[in-house]
Interface confidence: low
């Protein structure tokens, strides 16, 4: 009833709780002396369904037959309307429309751990929309019975709070769940099980790993389990992998040796348990153990390359470069690199440990036969040394690769192609493609990149450390025994017209011609590989087209003579630079007049 229904009553027949599709009769009646003050026949009783008026009647009572009510709760309110006054609430009722419970399905019981309690779950079926009680019953040997009730609208889980023990693991238990509401009841099919069927062990705990003699090949995993566990499954993977390695073990008694772990790798380990070979279920996976395996001595060999630079008549500079070993080859933290330099005829040798760098530069005599060996060392030992005989890599002209070209290949890639050398191509043992940013000063500090290519290849895609709008000096070496030939080319992955022209810094007169000197365009303004410079000149104050001279770009060149100027005429000169994408804007303008009249 609503607010104690002091003025009247609302009755509902056959019941406040009805089956979907049923009809109800609602009666609203006034209590004595609760009608309109003056004239009871003026009583107007109005029935509302929620806030919508559905019926009215003059008098002391109102009857209404209602059909088609939806699932759930519908509120009916009866009000009294008297002349010259607001409607007064008399009483109300809620009608609950629902269905009888369906048969609960898939009843399943589990006991988590040997010390846990039995809990069961089931599927309720469709919502009854009514208050529904579920009763779970468990019967066991010796007529033992347990019962638990649940009054939760969404009840599909109950814990008996009892613990099954392994004293008689083959004893049968039967569970059944019954759903009851105002419209009916329904019971599940019984579920029969034994202790071994429903006990799900707790996940293993206290997992640890030991490496005998700090060796990855002698590794044992330890853990603790509940007492009755018979089977375990182990899974493990490198922390950066998504794929698990899986191992099943029987009667492990809390330990297992692992034989296939990689050195210096962080692994994740998990373990699960089961009580019986074919009964029951696996435990949840244990919490993860994360552990790093010990180092082993490096495998593989360093990829080493070198550069020679002439210093003077007696000395040369050797720069060695090498690439880091892969993680799987390093098998630990590389502590240092050992470089040995040896003069092969005199036997003189020098060894140096390099830390924090993958390059080394030294000066050696130009005479003698020199060799280097480079190896990488971690806490367990060193890799096999890579040995290289120092030779003049470009000495053998007949070994020089032919028709070398460099073309942009997508974003930040350059495709280098070549033809085998004229000399017997089968003599080539390997090609090395080397590239570095082009710096007009020939800066030896610029990082060197290289890749090795098999002797039957005539192309290589270079992508490492390639930036857009930067020009690279690319060399292709053909190596054969102690001989080498090379060819070079300039290339870029992306280019546009240079941002500025060269700056003329001096004009000097020599025997009736002039020599123009300029400063190189800053690398960041070249916007790719320069192909040409242009020198423009015209008579001052003249409107005629300027004359020009085009000079092929050479890295080291920064001056050029012009001998077509007339004496005693003042000229204006300027320069531009060109890439394959176009010409730069003008550089600075300079005036000059032959015979000492330059400004």
């Amino acid at each position: 009833k609503i607010d104690a229904c002091k003025r009247g009553d609302v009755t509902v027949k056959p019941s406040h709780v009805i089956l979907l599709g049923s009809t109800v009769n609602i009666t609203c009646s006034l209590k004595p002396r609760q009608g309109c003050f003056h004239y009871s026949r003026r009583n107007k009783l109005i029935l509302y369904k929620f806030d919508r008026r559905i019926n009215f009647h003059h008098g002391h009572s109102l009857n209404s037959q209602v059909t088609g009510l939806p699932l759930g709760t519908t509120l009916f309110v009866c009000k009294l309307a008297c002349i010259n006054s607001d409607e007064i609430q008399i009483c109300g009722a809620e009608i609950f429309v629902g269905v009888a419970p369906e048969q609960p399905q898939n009843l399943s019981c589990i006991q988590k751990g040997e010390q846990g309690t039995v809990a069961c779950t089931w599927e309720r079926g469709r919502d009854t929309h009514l208050y529904t009680e579920y009763t779970l019953q468990l019967s066991g040997p010796k007529n033992l019975t347990w019962q638990k009730q649940c009054k939760d609208i969404y009840c599909d889980y109950l814990d008996f709070g009892i613990n099954l023990t392994p004293e008689s693991p083959e004893s049968n238990f039967t569970a059944k769940v019954t759903a009851v509401n105002s419209l009916g009841s329904s019971s599940s099919l019984p579920s029969t099980f034994t202790f071994l069927d429903i006990v799900r062990p707790l996940p293993p705990w206290d997992i640890r790993i030991k490496f005998q003699k700090a060796s990855v090949s002698r590794c044992t995993l330890y853990w603790r389990d509940e007492g009755l566990v018979l089977l375990n499954r182990l899974r493990y993977r490198p922390s950066n992998s998504r794929l698990w390695n899986m191992v099943n073990v029987t009667k492990a008694k809390g330990r297992h040796d692992l034989l296939d772990l990689k050195p210096f790798t962080e692994y994740e380990f998990q373990i699960s348990s089961k009580l019986h070979l074919y009964k029951g279920s696996w435990s949840d996976w244990s919490e993860s153990l994360r552990a790093q395996t010990p180092e082993e001595e490096p495998t593989g060999m360093l990829d080493v390359w070198y550069m020679k630079r002439h210093i003077d008549y007696s000395r040369q500079q050797i720069s060695l470069f090498w690439k880091n070993l892969s993680v799987s080859e390093a098998r630990g933290k590389i502590l240092h690199y050992q470089v040995t330099l040896q003069e092969l005829t005199g036997g003189k040798a020098m060894t140096q440990n390099i830390t924090g760098h993958t390059s080394w530069t030294t000066v050696i005599p130009r005479t003698g036969n020199w060799a280097v060996a480079v190896s990488a060392a971690n806490s367990k030992g060193s890799s096999l040394p890579t040995r290289i005989n120092i030779m003049n890599l470009c000495e053998a002209g007949l070994l020089a690769p032919r028709q070398v070209s460099a073309n942009s290949e997508g974003m930040d890639n350059i495709l280098v192609t070549w033809q085998p050398p004229r000399k017997d191509p089968s003599a080539v043992q390997e090609y090395v493609v080397e590239w570095r940013e082009l710096h007009p000063g020939g800066d030896t500090q610029v990082p060197l990149n290289w890749l090795r290519s098999r002797p039957y290849n005539v192309s290589a895609l270079i992508s490492e450390n390639i930036k857009s709008y930067i020009c690279y000096e690319i060399r292709v070496y053909a190596l054969s025994g102690d001989q080498g030939g090379c060819s070079s080319i300039l290339g870029n992955s992306k280019h546009k017209a240079p941002l500025s022209g060269p700056h003329i810094n001096a004009i000097t007169e020599e025997k009736g011609s002039i020599l123009i000197s300029w400063n190189s365009i800053p690398v960041q303004e070249q916007m790719g590989c320069l192909l040409h410079y242009r020198i423009y000149w015209k008579e001052r104050d003249s409107n005629s087209q300027p004359q020009l001279c085009e000079i092929p770009y050479r890295v080291s060149q920064n001056s050029h003579p012009i001998n077509s100027l007339q004496p005693r005429v003042t000229y204006v000169l300027w320069m531009t630079a060109l890439t394959a994408a176009g010409e730069s804007s003008h550089g600075n303008e300079r005036e000059f007049c032959l015979q000492g009249k330059a400004n």
Epitope: I2, G72, Y131
Partner: nanobody, 123 residues
């Protein structure tokens, strides 16, 4: 067994809003219908509104209809009373109440009650 604790009351100016919360303990709170009531000084306890267990059905007293809204978050075991356009006559202690037998007719006969929270609306 369910314990109810109201919060969110306080002093507010007429025309402003306030949100009361009714927090419940107990795993099966989502099975309960929850009602809000209020009691002004010297007056009887008055029904404000109520919400069904699922939140699908609400019902309000005429005096608050259109201004007050009841909602619930069963995951948080909490029912809310959002009060907008407050008037001085809304000043009262507000109680929430819960009942498991949600098929009974709506009345003041709720089984579980909170201690109440004071709401004062000044003009």
């Amino acid at each position: 067994q369910v314990q109810l604790v109201e919060s969110g009351g306080g002093l507010v100016q007429a025309g402003n809003s306030l949100r009361l919360s009714c927090a419940a303990s107990g795993r099966t709170f989502s099975s309960y219908v929850v009602g809000w009531f209020r009691q002004a000084p010297g007056k009887e306890r008055e029904f404000v509104g109520r919400i069904s267990w699922s939140g699908a059905r609400t019902y309000y007293a005429d005096s608050v209809k259109g201004r007050f809204t009841i909602s619930r978050d069963n995951a948080k075991n909490t029912v809310y009373l959002q009060m907008n356009s407050l008037k001085p006559e809304d000043t009262a202690v507000y109680y929430c109440a819960a009942d498991l037998k949600w098929e009974v007719l709506l009345s003041e006969h709720f089984e579980y009650w909170g201690q109440g929270t004071q709401v004062t609306v000044s003009s």
